[in-house]
């Protein structure tokens, strides 16, 4: 049984040209993560395993840096990057967890941070 | 295995500088972050800053802005941190410490620094 | 920048007693929360990570707990080897940071 939740950073915006950090944590569970996986709808962006360390996908190299922590900062926003973002967290055994962030990049300078919440 | 490799000492003159070296083995190099950690005498542990070596991103704690700079050589896994204006503050243990998944998992055996005329 | 408070300071106890070890942050950390042990003239050692988190090769008299703001670092029945200083880390936010430690000295 999956007793485990992802927290993540939630609904969050930021400016054009700025960066944004994308954090999730796994809690309330006793199994052993062997990976965590980025995701921007159907593209990797980044995976780090616990044997491997970080791999960040080349197409986002100049762009992503890994953390902090297993969190993932994305930097030179443009507008495209607005859209789906899931952690993707392999363990054993429970298996995978998956969260959600939805990053609105905004032209403007009236960016505010979304509130959190929980995903089962 | 892996390893990362400190020497043990350096003793330098106030107001000198010096670099430090980390050589890593047993893993790639460039899929971890490298910490560096400053112990002084019978204190606590101080996280310094952090680089990554894939793309050479750092981060410093905001005390050490002007005392310290990271850098890396891909080419021989090795890093450096270079501390510049050295007091008898700066006289410390630094270790060196890597984290991909969880954080300092190895260790260096930490080279201790003297500063003194 | 995230402040990590442990106490007490020191911890003067008897081998085979069981013990717990506190670590405050200043804001909430969730669960990035790692224990380390130092022994004298030697590099720190990682304990527990992510709160409670098992690591290959530590003894299993080891274990964490908490969320949030409050950790706990237990030991039980303490052995000789297992006296030392510790410390808590959060990899949260940069920087990152350290408690002040917890001296475990033989009563």
């Known amino acids: 049984m999956m007793t485990g939740t992802i927290e993540t950073t939630g609904n969050i915006s930021a400016e054009k040209g700025g960066s944004i950090i994308l954090q999730c944590h796994l809690s309330s569970t006793t199994a052993q993560v062997t990976q965590v996986n980025w995701e921007q709808q159907d593209q990797l962006l980044a995976i780090c395993n616990a044997d491997l360390g970080w791999h960040i996908s080349p197409s986002f190299k100049d762009r992503v840096a890994p953390g902090p922590g297993l969190g993932l900062t994305l930097q030179s926003l443009t507008v495209n990057d607005t859209g789906e973002y899931f952690c993707i967290y392999h363990t054993y055994p429970d298996g995978t967890y998956t969260g959600r962030i939805f990053l609105e990049v905004l032209e403007s300078s009236v960016a505010e941070h979304g509130a959190r919440f929980q995903i089962p | 295995q892996v390893q990362l490799q400190q020497p043990g000492s350096e003793l330098v003159r106030p107001g000198a500088s010096v670099k430090l070296s980390c050589k890593a083995s047993?893993?790639?190099?460039?899929?971890?972050?490298m910490h560096w950690v400053k112990q002084r005498h019978g204190q606590g542990l101080e996280w310094i800053g952090n680089i990554y070596p894939g793309s050479g991103t750092t981060n410093y704690d905001e005390k050490f802005k002007n005392k310290g700079t990271l850098t890396v050589d891909t080419s021989s896994s090795t890093a450096y941190i270079h501390l510049s204006s050295l007091t008898s503050e700066d006289s410390a243990v630094y270790y060196c410490t890597r984290e991909g998944l969880y954080p300092f998992d190895y260790w260096g055996q930490g080279t201790t620094l003297t500063v003194s005329s | 920048d995230i402040v990590l408070t442990q106490s007490p300071a020191t911890l003067s106890v008897t081998p085979g007693d069981s013990v717990s070890l506190s670590c405050r942050a200043s804001q909430s950390i969730r669960n990035s929360l790692h224990w380390f042990q130092q022994k004298s003239h030697e590099s720190p050692r990682l304990l527990i990570k992510y709160v409670f988190q098992s690591i290959s090769g530590i003894p299993s008299r080891f274990s964490g707990s908490g969320s949030g703001t409050d950790f706990t670092l237990s030991i039980n029945s303490l052995e000789t080897e297992d006296f030392g200083m510790y410390f808590c880390q959060q990899s949260n936010s940069w920087p990152y940071t350290f408690g002040g430690g917890t001296k475990l000295e033989i009563k």
């Open positions: 047993g893993y790639t190099f460039t899929s971890y972050w």
